[in-house]
């Protein structure tokens, strides 16, 4: 019972984590314009892995995709790769783990096969989570480096005359979503690996013991005892993640209650 619960919980946690990794990868707010200690602008810049956006205080938002592949920084490419690898591994892990779930019966699949599949999916979730955490951390490190560089060069120009105010970027919401999602996927993977140990059939062979009774001799030899729990599950399928994303390159996104002016 505990094994099934651990496996099921691991699956759900990983599912939420992978949904989060997908969401973070698609989000535009990987880096956002730093507003602290800066001249107050009527324009707000933010950037994602795939496009950069500008939101005016008027509510008009314009996003431009990074249409070049070779012109992009190597670090950004690396982050993209890590996130995509994380998503792919996570998706495969989810597929494998569905068939590995103890509450789902598929033909006459042995418990040993389910245990192997559970372990495989667990490892995939762990690697997926680590990829996401690594990707987000690399991007965060890149931001920190650029932040201090742009702070040092905040005011550029001849003879100390201010020429331009450089836009500084700080951590966006996607980074926090990515870290949390990566962590959840990692935890889910660990739980799957723990569940795998409980699923593996233990062949415990007890040595023959002779019981001598008066009158006649009886030899009692118990065979290998295999514990099996027939767990009849009535689990309902819940839709955890709906990845319906809508992107527009130029939209008048009207001022909302959370917009700044």
């Amino acid at each position: 019972m505990a094994v099934t619960a651990c496996q099921g919980l691991g699956f759900v946690v990983s599912l939420i984590g992978i949904a989060g990794i997908i969401a973070a990868t698609c989000m535009d707010q990987w880096s956002t314009q730093d507003l602290y200690n800066n001249p107050v602008t009527a324009v707000f810049n933010y950037q994602g892995l795939w496009r950069s956006c500008v939101r005016e205080s008027s509510g008009f938002t314009e996003c431009r995709g990074y249409f070049t592949l070779l012109g992009l920084p190597a670090m950004l490419q690396a982050v993209r790769a890590l996130m995509i690898v994380g998503i792919v591994l996570g998706a495969i892990g989810l597929l494998v783990s569905i068939f590995a779930l103890k509450c789902i019966r598929i033909g006459s699949m042995e418990d040993s096969a389910k245990a192997n599949m559970t372990l495989t999916s667990g490892i995939m979730f762990i690697v997926s989570g680590l990829c996401a955490i690594a990707g987000v951390s690399v991007f965060a490190n890149m931001l920190v480096t650029n932040f201090w560089m742009s702070t040092a060069n905040m005011y550029t120009g001849m003879g100390g005359m201010v020429q331009t105010v450089q836009t500084r970027y700080t951590f966006g919401a996607a980074l926090f979503v990515g870290w949390v999602a990566g962590g959840l996927t990692l935890i889910g993977g660990v739980m799957m690996c723990i569940a795998c140990r409980g699923l593996a059939p233990e062949e415990t062979n007890y040595k023959a013991v002779s019981y001598h009774a008066s009158g006649h001799s009886v030899a009692y030899k118990p065979g290998g005892f295999k514990a099996s729990t027939g767990f009849g599950s009535n689990t309902k399928n819940k839709k955890i993640y709906d990845g319906g994303a809508r992107t527009e390159d130029e939209v008048q996104s009207y001022p909302s209650k959370h917009d700044y002016v």
Epitope: P39, T41, A42, S58, R64, P255, V261
Partner: antibody, heavy 118, light 113 residues
Framework: QVQLVQSGAEVKKPGSSVKVSCKPS????????IDWVRQAPGQGLEWMGG????????VYNEKFQGRVTLTADESTSTAYMELSSLRSEDTAVYFC???????????WGQGTLVTVSS | DIVMTQSPDSLAVSLGERATINCKSS????????????LTWYQQKPGQPPKLLIY???TRESGVPDRFSGSGSGKDFTLTISSLQAEDVAVYYC?????????FGGGTKVEIK
């Protein structure tokens, strides 16, 4: 078409307050910011502040901070600008305008002349 | 505050001739995020509210005649009326739409010579 209709001219005493209204039509009131700009007689334009009618969020020109209050009433789709502690140099035509892309003002009210005189 | 300096203060041009108005900002109005300059040009005729001509330094507002054009980047901007018409007699203002407070230039009065 888009129109912004402002309240009529006002004559005020120094130290008093004035409240000018601006009623836009031809678009959804909460979808665009409303800015207030004033113009003293024979002078240039001076931005006073702006309001997001949907949230009530405001941004002010520090020159008027504490004296100007911008509000919006969603039920009547009307924006208001109140200027307190009036002095003679506040005599001007006050305009409301709709902020659009480029943070520019595409539609303006006809203007409200506020005269501050003792 | 960002200071917007317009030159000249007034300009007398013959009908059909080119009129050029300059506007200088104390700080760059170029946004690195979209490479757009947040500068707007308005036309104001006596007794009327200002009328939007050009935004993003060079994008003409719909309905504005194509004889009006905007150019420049960073700190220096220009409004050009390629062939002055009688109805173009007005005061022209440039506006900083990037930094708060949103500031206007002092205005340039265009007259017919």
């Amino acid at each position: 078409q888009v129109q912004l209709v402002q309240s009529g001219a006002e004559v005020k005493k120094p130290g008093s307050s004035v409240k000018v209204s601006c009623k836009p039509s031809g678009y959804t009131f909460t979808n665009y910011l409303i800015d207030w700009v004033r113009q003293a007689p024979g002078q240039g334009l001076e931005w006073m502040g702006g309001i997001n009618p949907g949230s009530g969020d405001t941004v002010y020109n520090e020159k008027f901070q504490g004296r100007v209050t911008l509000t919006a009433d969603e039920s009547t789709s009307t924006a208001y600008m109140e200027l307190s502690s009036l002095r003679s140099e506040d005599t001007a035509v006050y305009f409301c305008a709709r902020r659009v892309r480029g943070n520019s003002f595409d539609s303006w009210g006809q203007g409200t002349l506020v005269t501050v005189s003792s | 505050d960002i200071v917007m300096t317009q030159s000249p203060d007034s300009l007398a041009v013959s009908l059909g001739e080119r009129a050029t108005i300059n506007c200088k900002s104390s700080q760059s109005l170029l946004n690195s995020g979209n490479q757009k300059n947040y500068l707007t040009w308005y036309q104001q005729k006596p007794g009327q509210p200002p009328k939007l001509l050009i935004y993003w330094a060079s994008t003409r507002e719909s309905g504005v005649p194509d004889r009006f054009s905007g150019s420049g980047s960073g700190k220096d901007f220009t409004l050009t009326i390629s062939s002055l018409q009688a109805e173009d007699v007005a005061v022209y203002y440039c506006q900083n739409n990037y930094f708060y407070p949103l500031t206007f230039g002092g205005g340039t009065k265009v007259e017919i010579k």
